[in-house]
Structure formats: structure tokens, C-alpha cells
């Protein structure tokens, strides 16, 4: 039988490199039993993550699946950089690992920098 | 039912570019994380890289030079290719897909066997 | 790199009796809060085929003569007992860190 430990699936050092303009999901896959529980996304500013309170969350079901959304209406430029997911379950505090979006301006997109390059520019 | 179905040349000669196709029903490739796999005449499996549900790709470092994964969402494909190949990229090569809850393969194609000879 | 080194590489069991392989990590597979460890069976000329993930869930449509279990750096794949069927060479596989990889593998035979 199954635990019913909630569990985040975030891809440890998982990156994304999408385009600025576009929609954009980030999935935060939660693993959980009977209660679903409170999770937030946060963005990580040096050590500290920033919890995002203003922007457009929702709850997709699909496969025996649930995934915490994080929106972007559109990407925009400074979206880049790392997010956490956090579950709030029976008073745990449960943190996945962080997700890099490297957001590429659309005008710039022929000349796309590389994801080196996209991480310098964000730690700099 | 999920399937996957790899197709590509069996025979490629050395220093060429293998190119292989994993053809993918029942789900989506805009969901998940999809994968190429190689096991070796010794038996040895060899994780090769991934590419995901944005498009986002990773691939084991030591192939990193050599390697590409790309897809066609609206082919529900996703393919592998391989530079400069020699003898010892002589294998059977995978598809699979990876579940979300923890990354294993739920589900696998049955496999193309590539030998590399001149 | 994690390596996984399994134990022992061949095993030749008699029908009806419990088989152990053991899988050993060189690091801890525990950051997910969860176990990554999972494994396979792969018969002559098919697909590794989905047997335990998370170390411990036996995957749908697995008999319950499979079990996993385990945590840390030590995890054990059980079959007792023992079929004809069961016949394979038998992988552990990490994806708690990448890149993913595999046990050398476990050669069942029947004896």
C-alpha cells in the first residue's frame, strides 16, 4: 500500500527555457492521499524565497495526477529565475527542490544566449 | 494505453549521425518527461537524457557533446540524435516515458537495434 | 554519478523458493523525501518492464510475489516464490539524481 506522505515532484536542477510574450505553466506535480493540501510557489531571491501572493494559481487533475500551476499571462522578463513549490500538510512544511526559468526575449530569440549565459545574467 | 515506438536505420557507419524517431499515443508529449535509454551488447543500460513536457531537455554529461533531443508536438514525436558515432554506440535504444511521482518508466518502446560498422 | 551495485549478479533458484537481490547505493537516494529507487525485469528481447517504484510500490498488474524494500544506500528486490516465468535479468534504477542509472543487473535462473 502506498504512504500517504505528500510528496512534491519538482525535478531537482530542472530548467526551463521559454519565450517572453508566450503562456506559460510551471507544474508542480503534488503527490498526496485523502486532503489535499495548502501549497504555495515562491521565487527565490538570493537565500530567501518570495512568496508569490498576487499572481494566478489553479489545480489541475489529470491521470491520477494533481499538479499545483504557477501562470504566466504572458512571460515576462524578469519571470526569470528559480522557483519552489511548498505544501502546507497536518502542520509540515514540505519544500520541493527549485525550477530556472531562462526567459529568452522574443525579439532576441534568433540570437537566443545560452543557458550558461542566462544563469550568469541572473546570479550577477 | 500509452505506446511508444521507436524507428530509426539499424546499420550506421562511423563518424555519422544516428537520427532515431520515438513515435508516442495515448498521451501527450507536452506531459511528462520523455526519455531515451541504450543497453549495451554487455547488458550495461546507459540513461541518455530527457526531454519534458516544456520542451526543456537534459542529457547524461557524458554524451553531452554529442547529443541532441528535440520533439514535434503536433507529430506527438520525439527524437534522438547522436554525432560522430563509433563501434561502441553499438546498442539497443529506448523510449520511455517518466512518471511524474518519482521519474521511473512506466512505460517503454520495444526497442531498435543499432549496430555501428563500416 | 550514483552508482548501484548490485548483488549478486546471478542467482539460479529453485521453484517456489524466495529469491533476494540486493541493490546498493554509493549515495543516499532520499531527497525527494521519498525513496527514488525503483525496478525492472527484462526477459530476452522485450523492454525492461516496470516491477517496484519508490522502492516499495509494486507497479499495477505486478504479481504480489514481487516486493521491494529499503531506504538510504541498501534496497532489496524479493521474490518468493519463485516461478518459471520469472526468468530475466533484473535492474535497480535511481532518478533521484542526474544523470539516472542502473544496476549492473541480476541474472535469475531457475535450479
Known amino acids: 500500500k502506498e504512504s500517504c506522505d505528500v510528496q512534491l515532484y519538482i525535478k531537482r536542477q530542472s530548467e526551463h527555457s521559454i519565450l517572453a510574450g508566450r503562456p506559460f505553466e510551471l507544474e508542480c506535480p503534488v503527490k498526496y492521499c485523502a486532503n489535499r493540501p495548502h501549497v504555495t510557489w515562491c521565487k527565490l531571491n538570493g537565500t530567501t524565497c518570495v512568496k508569490l501572493e498576487d499572481r494566478q494559481t489553479s489545480w489541475k487533475e489529470e491521470k491520477n495526477i494533481s499538479f499545483f500551476i504557477l501562470h504566466f499571462e504572458p512571460v515576462l522578463p524578469n519571470d526569470n529565475g528559480s522557483y519552489r513549490c511548498s505544501a502546507n500538510f497536518q502542520s509540515n512544511l514540505i519544500e520541493s527542490h527549485s525550477t530556472t526559468l531562462y526567459v529568452t526575449d522574443v525579439k532576441s530569440a534568433s540570437e537566443r544566449p545560452s543557458k550558461d549565459e542566462m544563469a550568469s545574467r541572473f546570479w550577477a | 494505453e500509452v505506446q511508444l515506438q521507436e524507428s530509426g536505420p539499424s546499420l550506421v557507419k562511423p563518424s555519422q549521425t544516428l537520427s532515431l524517431t520515438c513515435s508516442v499515443t495515448?498521451?501527450?508529449?507536452?506531459?511528462?518527461?520523455w526519455n531515451w535509454i541504450r543497453k549495451f551488447p554487455g547488458n550495461k543500460l546507459e540513461y541518455m537524457g530527457y526531454?519534458?513536457?516544456?520542451?526543456?531537455?537534459y542529457f547524461n554529461p557524458s554524451l553531452k557533446s554529442r547529443i541532441s533531443i528535440t520533439r514535434n508536438t503536433s507529430k506527438n514525436q520525439y527524437y534522438l540524435q547522436l554525432n560522430s558515432v563509433t563501434t561502441e554506440d553499438t546498442a539497443t535504444y529506448y523510449c520511455?516515458?517518466?512518471?511524474?511521482?518519482?521519474?521511473?518508466?512506466?512505460?517503454w518502446g520495444h526497442g531498435t537495434t543499432l549496430t555501428v560498422s563500416s | 554519478d550514483i552508482v548501484l551495485t548490485q548483488s549478486p549478479a546471478s542467482l539460479a533458484v529453485s521453484l517456489g523458493q524466495r529469491a533476494t537481490i540486493s541493490c546498493r547505493a554509493s549515495?543516499?537516494?532520499?531527497?525527494?523525501?521519498?525513496?527514488?529507487m525503483h525496478w525492472y525485469q527484462q526477459k530476452a528481447g522485450q523492454p525492461p518492464k516496470l516491477l517496484i517504484y519508490?522502492?516499495?510500490n509494486l507497479e499495477s498488474g505486478i504479481p504480489a510475489r514481487f516486493s521491494g524494500s529499503g531506504s538510504r544506500t541498501d534496497f532489496t528486490l524479493t521474490i518468493n516464490p519463485v516461478e518459471a516465468d520469472d526468468v530475466a535479468t533484473y535492474y535497480c534504477?535511481?532518478?533521484?539524481?542526474?544523470?539516472?542509472?542502473f544496476g549492473g543487473g541480476t541474472k535469475l535462473e531457475i535450479k
Open positions: 519508490r522502492a516499495s
Open positions: 526531454i519534458s513536457y516544456s520542451g526543456s531537455t
Open positions: 495515448g498521451d501527450s508529449i507536452t506531459s511528462a518527461y
Open positions: 520511455a516515458r517518466s512518471h511524474y511521482y518519482g521519474y521511473y518508466f512506466d512505460y
Open positions: 549515495e543516499t537516494i532520499d531527497s525527494y523525501g521519498d525513496s527514488l
Open positions: 534504477q535511481q532518478t533521484d539524481e542526474d544523470p539516472y542509472t
